[in-house]
């Protein structure tokens, strides 16, 4: 069975009040993607199902937009949005793949001065 690779936007930072695109890309496999889940820590953000389309979790409906592609756009960011985000690809016949993104939401003045979050 061929094993693919998940590429993500990695560790990213954004300004409070702004928006950010979370992107994952599955490559190096011919597996069929049947569903992609977007999760934040222990919360479901959204599902993109190959047959049923997008479902945005009710608690995020006002601030989450589907796309581009299989990605997710987070809007009206707050410092509470800082944390880990996961894209979970359900595929046939490979099984599941998970990508991890760490988002740091910065106060406007900090973001304007070019600060960037880094994991040592």
């Amino acid at each position: 069975m061929m094993t693919g690779t998940i590429e993500t936007t990695g560790n990213i930072s954004a300004e409070k009040g702004g928006s950010i695109i979370l992107q994952c890309h599955l490559s190096s496999t011919t597996a069929q993607v049947t569903q992609v889940n977007w999760e934040q820590q222990d919360q479901l953000l959204a599902i993109c199902n190959a047959d049923l389309g997008w479902h945005i979790s009710p608690s995020f409906k006002d601030r989450v937009a589907p796309g581009p592609g299989l990605g997710l756009t987070l809007q009206s960011l707050t410092v509470n949005d800082t944390g880990e985000y996961f894209c979970i690809y359900h595929t046939y016949p490979d099984g599941t793949y998970t990508g991890r993104i760490f988002l740091e939401v910065l106060e406007s003045s900090v973001a304007e001065h070019g600060a960037r979050f880094q994991i040592p």
Epitope: N37, E39, D42, L44, T96
Partner: nanobody
């Protein structure tokens, strides 16, 4: 080194029930999804059920309403309760998980050795 160890397979009559469990052990920093896939002779490995960290379950069409997946996060263990089993459920059942071994690593994809489930008519 991460290991997935399945238990609970066996022979059961049609209409009966069986429970499978899968325990992940080793170097585990985080688990995003655990689940079950099955493979009948001469066929591709197919989805049975998965359960994500956020609690979202996904089931294969042929098992919906009959099988139920659950977990014990503290024990890094996932369970599959199979009811109203049919002869066409006969297959090798594999545990599958996406596991991060350290804070700096990416999620690896792991499979168990498989456990045979045979449903007789």
């Amino acid at each position: 080194q991460v290991q997935l160890v399945e238990s609970g397979g066996g022979l059961v009559q049609a209409g009966g029930s069986l429970s499978l469990s899968c325990a992940a052990s080793g170097s585990i920093f985080g688990i995003s999804v655990m689940g079950w896939y099955r493979q009948a002779p001469g066929e591709q490995r197919d989805l049975v059920a998965t359960l994500t960290r956020a609690g979202l379950t996904t089931y294969g069409d042929s098992v919906k309403g009959r099988f139920s997946i659950s977990r014990d996060s503290a024990k890094n263990t996932v369970y599959l309760q199979m009811n109203n089993l049919k002869p066409e459920d006969t297959a090798v059942y594999y545990c599958h998980a996406n596991i991060m071994e350290s804070a700096a690593s990416t999620f690896g994809r792991y499979w168990g050795q498989g456990t045979q489930v045979t449903v007789s008519s």
